[in-house]
Interface confidence: medium
């Protein structure tokens, strides 16, 4: 069996996880993609997914999670804004390909969120400027309910990263402390 490896992020409350999941362009560009959390001994739980078929660079927001699928580059961008300690846990990106099981995009992401000063949006160490706003849309109903039994893991830390949809939009101009870690080719 393939050894499941993890990539670790250490962030503070209020910061933003900002990651990408690469996929094979030709095969999966328009496939529906999802962001899942894997809790201790449980099946992966889908927190957010793209539309079906997935639209190119169209932001989908579910609560504090924002997904953007860049077909031309073969990458899904995932952001979790205003992180909380309870968001700590193990995450993964998957591609839905019914009737087959979801295809997992390696590696898994180990998120560790710790308490610490994060200030209010705009008061932090940096600024992110984005040309558009993300509308408050909910796409939970569009996400398939099945998950792969193969992806059950051995006791990762408990997490309660359930996501609620906010009443107002998130203006990404005010999101601070985005963490971007590298890709070196």
């Amino acid at each position: 069996a393939t050894k499941l490896t993890e990539e670790k992020y250490e962030l503070k409350e209020g910061q933003t996880l900002d990651v990408k999941c690469d996929y094979t362009l030709e095969k999966f560009a328009s496939s529906q993609k999802a962001w899942q959390i894997i809790r201790d001994g449980e099946m992966p739980k889908t927190l957010a997914c793209t539309e079906r078929p997935s639209k190119n660079s169209h932001p989908v927001q579910v609560g504090r999670i924002i997904l953007e699928d860049y077909h031309d580059h073969g990458l899904l961008r995932v952001r979790m804004v205003n992180l909380q300690v309870e968001d700590s846990g193990l995450y993964q990106c998957v591609i839905y390909q019914p009737p087959k099981e979801p295809h997992m995009l390696f590696d898994r992401i180990r998120l560790v969120v710790t308490k610490g000063f994060s200030g209010t949006p705009g008061s932090n160490e940096n600024s992110t400027q984005n040309v558009y706003k993300i509308p408050p849309t909910t796409t939970k109903a569009l996400c398939p309910l099945y998950t792969s039994p193969r992806t059950v893991t051995q006791a990762p830390p408990k997490s309660t990263a359930d996501v609620s949809t906010p009443d107002s939009e998130i203006n990404l101009t005010n999101v601070t402390d985005i963490i971007r870690v590298p890709v070196f080719n």
């Epitope: 690469d22 073969g74 984005n130 963490i179």
Partner: antibody, heavy 127, light 107 residues
Framework: QVQLVQSGAEVKKPGSSVKVSCKSS????????FTWVRQAPGQGLEWMGG????????NYAQKFQGRVTITADESTSTAYMELSSLRSEDTAVYYC????????????????????WGQGTTVTVSS | DIQMTQSPTSLSASVGDRVTITCRAS??????LAWYQQKPEKAPKSLIY???SLQSGVPSRFSGSGSGTDFTLTISSLQPEDFATYYC?????????FGQGTKLEIK
């Protein structure tokens, strides 16, 4: 391998602005992230901010917030850094740097990497 | 901001010596650390990323190690072209910050 060529040296008056360009060649511009770093005479390196063209986002160090604007023009494969309200302490060599970030296979990580560097642009602020 | 502290700030060594430069972060940064080499009047050059991965084209005498808060850059056998200033840099969180530099001089 991508190559970065920066614009020439500039001499500016305090209070004015400077716009430094960084032209990329040898790679797909939109697959790269661009960073700006400066180095004052005899000093160390200081990260100013960066841009990922396909995400249409720029990030800036708080120190430069409100004075710096980083942009990218995909049609000319050029990244720009504009610094306004110049003061004498902005006298420095300004470097652009880049790294490839998409299509990397297994890694989820991307960032404003500094694998390839431009030759640097000297900006002198003097009255 | 995360503070990066390098030691020593300057170092004299001879060709063939084994040299170690250390870098300490003021808080945990996982393995998100890079090392750069800079020669006078030149742009920096990337040596190491992700604490221990060697940048393409960099000689294997350079190596990096560490995670969390403590990191090292080691040059196993100094060559004449290695005399330069070395910087560490964290990219765990914004603003990315550099160490103050370590100047490696010929003894």
């Amino acid at each position: 391998q991508v190559q970065l060529v920066q614009s020439g040296a500039e001499v500016k008056k305090p209070g004015s602005s400077v716009k430094v360009s960084c032209k990329s060649s040898g790679g797909t511009f939109s697959s790269y992230a661009f960073t700006w770093v400066r180095q004052a005479p005899g000093q160390g390196l200081e990260w100013m901010g960066g841009i990922i063209p396909i995400f249409r986002t720029a990030n800036y160090a708080q120190k430069f917030q409100g004075r710096v604007t980083i942009t990218a023009d995909e049609s000319t494969s050029t990244a720009y850094m504009e610094l306004s309200s110049l003061r004498s302490e902005d006298t420095a060599v300004y470097y652009c740097a880049s790294s490839h970030f998409s299509g990397s296979g297994s890694s989820h990580y991307y960032y404003y990497g500094m694998h390839v560097w431009g030759q640097g642009t000297t900006v002198t602020v003097s009255s | 901001d995360i503070q990066m502290t390098q030691s020593p700030t300057s170092l004299s060594a001879s060709v063939g010596d084994r040299v170690t430069i250390t870098c300490r972060a003021s808080q945990g940064i996982s393995s998100w650390l890079a090392w750069y080499q800079q020669k006078p009047e030149k742009a920096p050059k990337s040596l190491i990323y992700a604490a221990s991965s060697l940048q393409s084209g960099v000689p294997s005498r350079f190596s990096g190690s560490g995670s969390g808060t403590d990191f090292t850059l080691t040059i196993s056998s100094l060559q004449p072209e290695d005399f330069a200033t070395y910087y560490c840099q964290q990219y765990n969180s914004y603003p990315y910050t550099f160490g103050q530099g370590t100047k490696l001089e010929i003894k």
